[in-house]
Interface confidence: low
């Protein structure tokens, strides 16, 4: 088992909103849960966009999930990752 490296980035969207993206890379096996949470609770599927779980050329995998949120509420959002029985939570960088 190779645990993922998780990286959260943010970019400007429409006025008052930002798009936050959570990327998991270099993990094996390919099964992974990656989702955005608000107040600790997973957002609905239709408010998130997922990338495919793709091989990264090193025998490991990569994927991403993104959502658009209100800039004033960004501290309420975290990216949750679960892989091979381990989990971690990642905040939006300020």
């Amino acid at each position: 088992t190779v645990p993922p490296m998780v990286n959260v980035t943010r970019s400007e969207a429409s006025e008052g909103n930002i798009t936050v993206t959570c990327r998991a890379s270099s993990f094996y096996p390919r099964n992974i849960i990656l989702t955005w949470r608000q107040d600790g609770v997973s957002l609905s599927h239709d408010t998130q966009q997922w990338g495919d779980v793709l091989p990264d050329g090193n025998g490991t995998y990569q994927t991403w999930v993104a959502t658009r949120i209100c800039r004033a509420e960004e501290q309420r959002f975290t990216c949750y990752m679960e892989h091979s029985g381990n989990h971690s939570t990642h905040p939006v960088p300020s």
Partner: antibody, heavy 122, light 112 residues
């Protein structure tokens, strides 16, 4: 499961502030959401706010935004709530509680501290 | 805010009886992610509350199977199939779907 040990009872004067602590052990502190709740004698519970220990991010019940301030000290795995401008209406037991959002659970207040009694009296 | 109304206020029971507690919310408490975050807590005198049921019908770890939760939308029920002495206390329902999260006023289960 872990433990949550709250600080002892407080007797404070109206207008003063009080800082309550909730020392945790037995789980990864920085991975958790911790809420504070209020219960007046013989009454129901009110949710005050939560803090995400990993970042110090918070969300407040609007009713308490001017009253409560939540902080964490990750080095000691302790959560704090400062309550300010106290009145007799703030006399209550205050609880800290840990959320359990992992796996399939999604439970809000899964593990509780023993509570701290705050009495506001002249 | 979502108002949670519990009935009855007091429920006298005999040990071994079935008890049924009701909780009604002032609005639908389905979270935007599709889950219904309705929980039940038991508080015994002088103790902290303890979680019994989460997401309407899921028993928390260590909770006996005589406790069961049901309901949807705005109407929810907690049933205790055979009341034991250790079940006496005040039961609170709680919604975590809409901020601010709110509790019901409680139902006190006591010996008849």
């Amino acid at each position: 499961q872990g433990q949550m040990q709250q600080s002892g009872a407080e007797l404070v004067k109206p207008g003063a502030s009080v800082k309550l602590s909730c020392k945790t052990s037995g789980f990864t502190f920085s991975d958790n959401y911790i809420s504070w709740l209020k219960q007046k004698p013989g009454q129901s519970l009110e949710w005050i706010a939560w803090i995400y220990a990993g970042t110090g991010g918070t969300s407040y019940n609007q009713k308490f935004t001017a009253k409560a301030q939540l902080t964490v000290d990750t080095s000691s795995s302790t959560a704090y709530m400062q309550f300010s401008s106290l009145t007799t209406e703030d006399s209550a037991i205050y609880y800290c509680a840990r959320h359990d959002y992992y796996g399939t659970s999604g439970a809000w207040f899964a593990y509780w501290g023993q509570g701290t009694l705050v009495t506001v009296s002249a | 805010d979502v108002l949670m109304t519990q009935t009855p206020l007091s429920l006298p029971v005999s040990l071994g009886d079935q008890a049924s507690l009701s909780c009604r919310s002032s609005q639908n408490i389905v979270h935007i992610n599709g889950n219904t975050y309705l929980e039940w807590y038991l508080q015994k005198p002088g103790q902290s509350p303890k979680l019994l049921i989460y997401k309407v019908s899921n028993r928390f770890s260590g909770v006996p199977d005589r406790f069961s939760g049901s309901g949807s939308g705005t109407d929810f029920t907690l049933k205790i199939s055979r009341v034991e002495a250790e079940d006496l206390g005040v039961y609170y329902c709680f919604q975590g779907s809409h901020v601010p999260w709110t509790f019901g006023g409680g139902t006190k289960v006591e010996i008849k």
